[in-house]
Structures are given as structure tokens and as C-alpha cells.
């Protein structure tokens, strides 16, 4: 039943070109190249893509033509290694070109940069964008793919094609509208926010595969798909998990053509077999390919079958528990996870994986005991504290969020996390804490039954951002420990961290707290980031500062910015009042 078993093709590049079509082929090759060589100019990438495309066409015409039998990694790697400025631009990444496949591709993958030194994307005026769109639509859309791909080197490539399709639709519609800006800007904001979320979710999938292995990813997929498709049989879920794992392994490994092709096949299979998978797929399956795949990935959970029997009969009372565990460990644990997950759409995936791990640990111990059944009879009782911990945490934090609102809730988290891991860079602490704080508006509005899967699985995505950014420049053993010990226990590990008593406070630097009139022209979001950056720096200077002290300083700071932005001579106000504020803050915090 494997969806992906295909006949061997004489020419892999011809096969993928024919399967995907020229437009998707070119777009995916551009994404692949931009994700590997993140600093290369757009024009250079377009040139490389055109050369690869022309070559692919010769192979479509004659699969026996020279070099057409080479693997895609060989063809693409050879092409990337023709870039003249490789050594100057990328330094040691150029050494990858001395290696043979598959080591060369692995080398390129290792040099992907999650935080590339690229300028922030500034959105031009609407009229400027519309003119560029009308002048050369193809180049305009390629530029979008290029700019997103190079900034997000693990973006899920077939999903980026879907974003590009929506991007094009937004410009097609809005550039003809009476009020172009009113039409276009909300759509672009939505695409930007969804794109960041999509990138972060995919980054977690790739981290799961690359750092914790295929088994970890498959466990995650069994749990999530069982929640989503609770009426599907275990065999069906297992088959979908195997195929989904292949798709994500390919995309995370840079095999974007294979990934997109296999994702399309998987969507086709799911739609052809909806009756045995889920009743919620009908609408998705009526859509065109890119929309269909996206829709399936986001589809709501199906209703749980009525009268599911107690799990105890199969996994505690059964005579065959240890036999199954000994002879078919992963299948048996997979069945446990499937049965538990389909009954608990109200649990986060990471909680379900913790329960499965606890069950596994118990069987590991008990199946070697004198009386196994007596030993594991109470295993389900061990689940209670594991379930209650995230429930209580979410309850407390949602109460805090409702009391404070998003901005102040983010600030509370900024203080909390800076005290836990003060060695982490300020931009990373601000970015991660802001995202952690968004859990409030994202999840607290949900009823109890949907809060945990929303909140804890979202936090897993955000904490993975912290982990990948920290891995690039490791500064904290505590972060390394929480990030590497257990994928499913990352959030509890960070939650359990107390104030780092070993931290030596940062030297006070007045320059850090010097502000200028340019803050007045910033958007509300940018202004918040400036204030939150200052807050992190304050905590790094004075980690033992109380909430009340920090609140007083931040309130004074907000009043200072508001006052000076209203002043006639803003710059003078910032200079003079700024000095006073710094002195008052130092006094208030005892610096």
C-alpha cells in the first residue's frame, strides 16, 4: 500500500519535471537554491534555475542524454558549486564542494542559517508594488519565493508554493481595487503572520527528524493523526504516518522536488480514501492541488467514534501486554499512542507522547519483574500528575493573560525567561518571549477542551525557535540541556527553571538606555519591541529586581516616550529627559 513506490526512472530530473510541470519545477529549484545559498543575489539564483531548467528539458526529450542519469543532489550540488564567490561569501561552506555525494549535500544542510544576516524586508508603497507586479509578474513572484526561502531555510517548500499563489491572487485583485492599500495591506499582513507561523511549525518538524530521529517524528505523527482521524483504523493511520514521514524527511533534507511530488501523491491518496480516513475531508478534496494539500494539513478533528472501549482491557488487563511489548515494541507502543490520542483530542500531542513514554518505561521495568501484571497494574495512575501539570499551567497563564492583556503578558514572560536564562542574547529573548506571549490571544479564547492542544503544542514550536537560535551560538548550558535532553519535555524543562543564581549581572551601560526621536515614527509593534528590549536589558543588569520595581521603571519609560514624542523639540527632550530617566531608574533599582 505504499503510495510512493515508483518504477525506477532513467532520469530523475526528467521524471520530476514531468510530474511537477515547468512552473512548479522552476519555483521549487529556486526555493532549494535560495535555502542553501542564502546570501546570493536574486539574479544569480534565477540564472542557475534557468540553466537547470534548460538541462531538465533536454532530459525530458531524451532521458539517455549526457548527465541525465545523475541524481538530483549531484546535479544541484554541481550547479551550486559553480558560484564564483562561494568562498568569499560563505567561507567554510565552500569546503562542501570538495566532498562527494551524499556528504556534500549533508555539508550544505549543516550550513543552513536560521538567523541569516540579511536586511529586514521593508514593504514598499502599494503603488510601487503594484507597478512592479504589472511590469513583470513572473519576476515579482520569483522574488517573493527567493526572499522568503533565504530567510526561512526550512520553509516547507510545497506550502511556500501555496503562499505564493495567495500572494499573486492578492495583487491581482487589489491592484485593480479603488482603494489598493485597504485591499492589499491586510492580506499581506495575514500572509506574513501565517508565513512566520508556518515556517516555525516546519522548523520543529525538521528539528524533530534531524535531532531526535525518525522514530520521534513518527510518534508525533501517530498522535496528531490519531486525534485528527479518530475513526481511521490503526493500520490506516500507520500508513499515513509512514508516507508523511517520507514527505517531511525529503523536505527537511533539501529534496524539494521529491517532497512536493510525494505530498501531492499523499493528498491524492487521502482524498481517494476519505471514507476510511475522515468525514471532514470532503471540502478539502474538492480544491485544486496546493489548496487541497494545505486544507488537509489544517483540517479539523473528526468526531470520535461512539462507545470506544476502555484502554485498560488492551493495555493493562490483557495477558499479552508483555508478549506484545517484547516482540513488537514499536507497533505495540504505536497502538497505545493511537488509542490514547483518538480518545483525547483535548490533550496536547506532547502530553500524549509523555504518557506513551511513561507507559514504555513502566513496561520496560515491569516486563522484567517477577509479577509483571502486578507491577504495571497501576500504570494509568502515573498519568494523572502528567495531565494536571499542563492543565494547571495553562489555567494560571490564561488568568494572567486575561488580567494583563497581550503586551503586559509578554513583558511578564520577558522578565520570567530573562531571569531563567540571562545569557541568551537580548534580540532572541525578545523575539521568543513575544511569541510565547502570543499564546494568550491564540489559545485562551478557546474552551477548556481545546486549550491544551492549542497552547502546549504552540509553545513547543516557539521553544524550538529558541533552541535553533541558541544552537547557532550556544551561551547557556541550561538552554542546551532543556533543548537536547527530550523533545517532549522541553516545555516542562523550561517551566521548571528557576532564576539563574550563577549569573553575574551585566555592567550598566547608559548607551543601552539612550533613545532618540526616531522611536516616535515607529509602528506600535516596533515601539513595543524597543521597550521590551530595554526591559530585558534592565533585568540583565538587575536580575533580582522585583516585579514592582520593573513595573515602575517601565511605566516611567512609557511616560517619557509619550512626553518626548509630543514635544516640539523631540531630540532635545529625549537627550535631557533621557538622562533624568536613566538616573531615576538606577536609583529605583539600586544600580
Amino acid at each position: 500500500r505504499g503510495v510512493f513506490r515508483r518504477d525506477a526512472h532513467k532520469s530523475e530530473v526528467a521524471h520530476r519535471f514531468k510530474d511537477l510541470g515547468e512552473e512548479n519545477f522552476k519555483a521549487l529549484v529556486l526555493i532549494a537554491f535560495a535555502q542553501y545559498l542564502q546570501q546570493c543575489p536574486f539574479e544569480d539564483h534565477v540564472k542557475l534555475v534557468n540553466e537547470v531548467t534548460e538541462f531538465a528539458k533536454t532530459c525530458v526529450a531524451d532521458e539517455s542524454a549526457e548527465n541525465c542519469d545523475k541524481s538530483l543532489h549531484t546535479l544541484f550540488g554541481d550547479k551550486l558549486c559553480t558560484v564564483a564567490t562561494l568562498r568569499e561569501t560563505y567561507g567554510e561552506m565552500a569546503d562542501c564542494c570538495a566532498k562527494q555525494e551524499p556528504e556534500r549535500n549533508e555539508c550544505f544542510l549543516q550550513h543552513k542559517d536560521d538567523n541569516p544576516n540579511l536586511p529586514r524586508l521593508v514593504r514598499p508603497e502599494v503603488d510601487v508594488m503594484c507597478t512592479a507586479f504589472h511590469d513583470n509578474e513572473e519576476t515579482f513572484l520569483k522574488k517573493y519565493l527567493y526572499e522568503i526561502a533565504r530567510r526561512h531555510p526550512y520553509f516547507y517548500a510545497p506550502e511556500l508554493l501555496f503562499f505564493a499563489k495567495r500572494y499573486k491572487a492578492a495583487f491581482t485583485e487589489c491592484c485593480q481595487a479603488a482603494d489598493k492599500a485597504a485591499c492589499l495591506l491586510p492580506k499581506l499582513d495575514e500572509l506574513r503572520d501565517e508565513g512566520k507561523a508556518s515556517s516555525a511549525k516546519q522548523r520543529l518538524k525538521c528539528a524533530s527528524l534531524q535531532k531526535f530521529g525518525e522514530r520521534a517524528f513518527k510518534a508525533w505523527a501517530v498522535a496528531r493523526l490519531s486525534q485528527r482521524f479518530p475513526k481511521a483504523e490503526f493500520a490506516e493511520v500507520s500508513k499515513l504516518v509512514t508516507d508523511l514521514t517520507k514527505v517531511h524527511t525529503e523536505c527537511c533534507h533539501g529534496d524539494l522536488l521529491e517532497c512536493a511530488d510525494d505530498r501531492a501523491d499523499l493528498a491524492k491518496y487521502i482524498c481517494e480514501n476519505q471514507d476510511s480516513i475522515s468525514s471532514k475531508l470532503k471540502e478539502c478534496c474538492e480544491k485544486p492541488l496546493l489548496e487541497k494539500s494545505h486544507c488537509i494539513a489544517e483540517v479539523e478533528n473528526d468526531e470520535m467514534p461512539a462507545d470506544l472501549p476502555s484502554l485498560a482491557a488492551d493495555f493493562v488487563e490483557s495477558k499479552d501486554v508483555c508478549k506484545n511489548y517484547a516482540e513488537a515494541k514499536d507497533v505495540f507502543l504505536g497502538m497505545f499512542l493511537y488509542e490514547y490520542a483518538r480518545r483525547h483530542p483535548d490533550y496536547s500531542v506532547v502530553l500524549l507522547l509523555r504518557l506513551a513514554k511513561t507507559y514504555e518505561t513502566t513496561l520496560e521495568k515491569c516486563c522484567a519483574a517477577a509479577d509483571p501484571h502486578e507491577c504495571y497494574a497501576k500504570v494509568f495512575d502515573e498519568f494523572k500528575p502528567l495531565v494536571e501539570e499542563p492543565q494547571n499551567l495553562i489555567k494560571q497563564n490564561c488568568e494572567l493573560f486575561e488580567q494583563l492583556g497581550e503586551y503586559k503578558f509578554q513583558n511578564a514572560l520577558l522578565v520570567r525567561y530573562t531571569k531563567k536564562v540571562p545569557q541568551v542574547s537580548t534580540p532572541t529573548l525578545v523575539e521568543v518571549s513575544r511569541n510565547l506571549g502570543k499564546v494568550g490571544s491564540k489559545c485562551c479564547k478557546h474552551p477548556e477542551a481545546k486549550r491544551m492542544p492549542c497552547a502546549e503544542d504552540y509553545l513547543s514550536v516557539v521553544l524550538n525557535q529558541l533552541c535553533v537560535l541558541h544552537e547557532k551560538t550556544p551561551v547557556s548550558d541550561r538552554v542546551t540541556k532543556c533543548c537536547t535532553e527530550s523533545l517532549v519535555n522541553r516545555r516542562p524543562c523550561f517551566s521548571a527553571l528557576e532564576v539563574d543564581e550563577t549569573y553575574v549581572p551585566k555592567e550598566f551601560n547608559a548607551e543601552t538606555f539612550t533613545f532618540h526621536a526616531d522611536i516616535c515614527t515607529l509602528s506600535e509593534k516596533e515601539r513595543q519591541i524597543k521597550k521590551q528590549t530595554a526591559l530585558v536589558e534592565l533585568v540583565k543588569h538587575k536580575p533580582k529586581a522585583t516585579k514592582e520595581q520593573l513595573k515602575a521603571v517601565m511605566d516611567d519609560f512609557a511616560a517619557f516616550v509619550e512626553k518626548c514624542c509630543k514635544a516640539d523639540d523631540k531630540e532635545t527632550c529625549f537627550a535631557e529627559e533621557g538622562k533624568k530617566l536613566v538616573a531615576a531608574s538606577q536609583a529605583a533599582l539600586g544600580l
Epitope: E233, F234, P309, A313, S318, D320, K323, V331
Partner: nanobody, 126 residues
């Protein structure tokens, strides 16, 4: 929908042998565990033997271990129960049953099985 049809039952002397067959349609036995249950007059159905689907594991009632052997032929979509050294207490109606989509037997509780054959009578005379 899964259809199960048993055959191979009959009357046999103690110490003799029989081979029961369970032919499945609408479901491949290669991916689903299949169980044999038996029910003697006036008694409850009891799990007798089982075989994993896509996982090579066999399961037996303690009293039949060493005498009965369960096997399957994926090409014929059929599961067999080879019964040797039969005893009068093996007399019962033998049923084939499945819980769809499960590669393992995780419970011997008859109430948890969704699909059943019509049964085949086995009588062992002394």
C-alpha cells in the same frame, strides 16, 4: 465490511487432527490480527489462538499450546488453525474474529471483536 467464513470442522477421535480455515474478504489478513475463539455448550466464548497482522506473533490459550498452530497465507487471505492431539474438552464451535486495522492481539476479550464468522463445529469423541 469484513466477511469471515470458517470451514474444516467435523467429528474426530481423541488424539486425531483437524485443520480449520478462515477465509477473509473485504480485509487483508496481512495487515490485521486474526483470532480464533471457541464456545463449548453452556460455556462462554474463549480465546483460543491468534496471529498478528504485519507482525509475526502468535498467541495461544495455555491449554492448547504445543498442540494447536495458527498460521496464515496472505496470498489466499486465509488463516488456518492446525489442531493436533485433540481432546474431548476441545469440543466446541470454533469462530474466527477480527478487530480491524490492528496488527496485534491486544485483548482476548470476545466483546472487543467487531467481526465474526458463522462458526464451524468441532466434535472430539473419546
Amino acid at each position: 465490511e469484513v466477511q469471515l467464513v470458517e470451514s474444516g470442522g467435523g467429528l474426530v477421535q481423541a488424539g486425531g487432527s483437524l485443520r480449520l480455515s478462515c477465509a477473509a474478504s473485504g480485509r487483508t489478513v496481512s495487515s490485521t490480527a486474526v483470532a480464533w475463539f471457541r464456545q463449548a455448550p453452556g460455556k462462554e466464548r474463549e480465546f483460543t489462538a491468534g496471529i498478528g497482522g504485519s507482525v509475526d506473533i502468535t498467541y495461544y490459550l495455555d491449554s492448547v499450546k504445543g498442540r494447536f498452530t495458527i498460521s496464515k497465507d496472505n496470498t489466499k487471505n486465509t488463516v488456518y488453525l492446525q489442531m493436533n492431539s485433540l481432546k474431548p474438552e476441545d469440543t466446541a464451535v470454533y469462530y474466527c474474529a477480527v478487530r480491524p486495522g490492528r496488527p496485534l492481539i491486544t485483548s482476548r476479550d470476545a466483546n472487543l471483536y467487531d467481526y465474526w464468522g458463522q462458526g464451524t463445529q468441532v466434535t472430539v469423541s473419546s
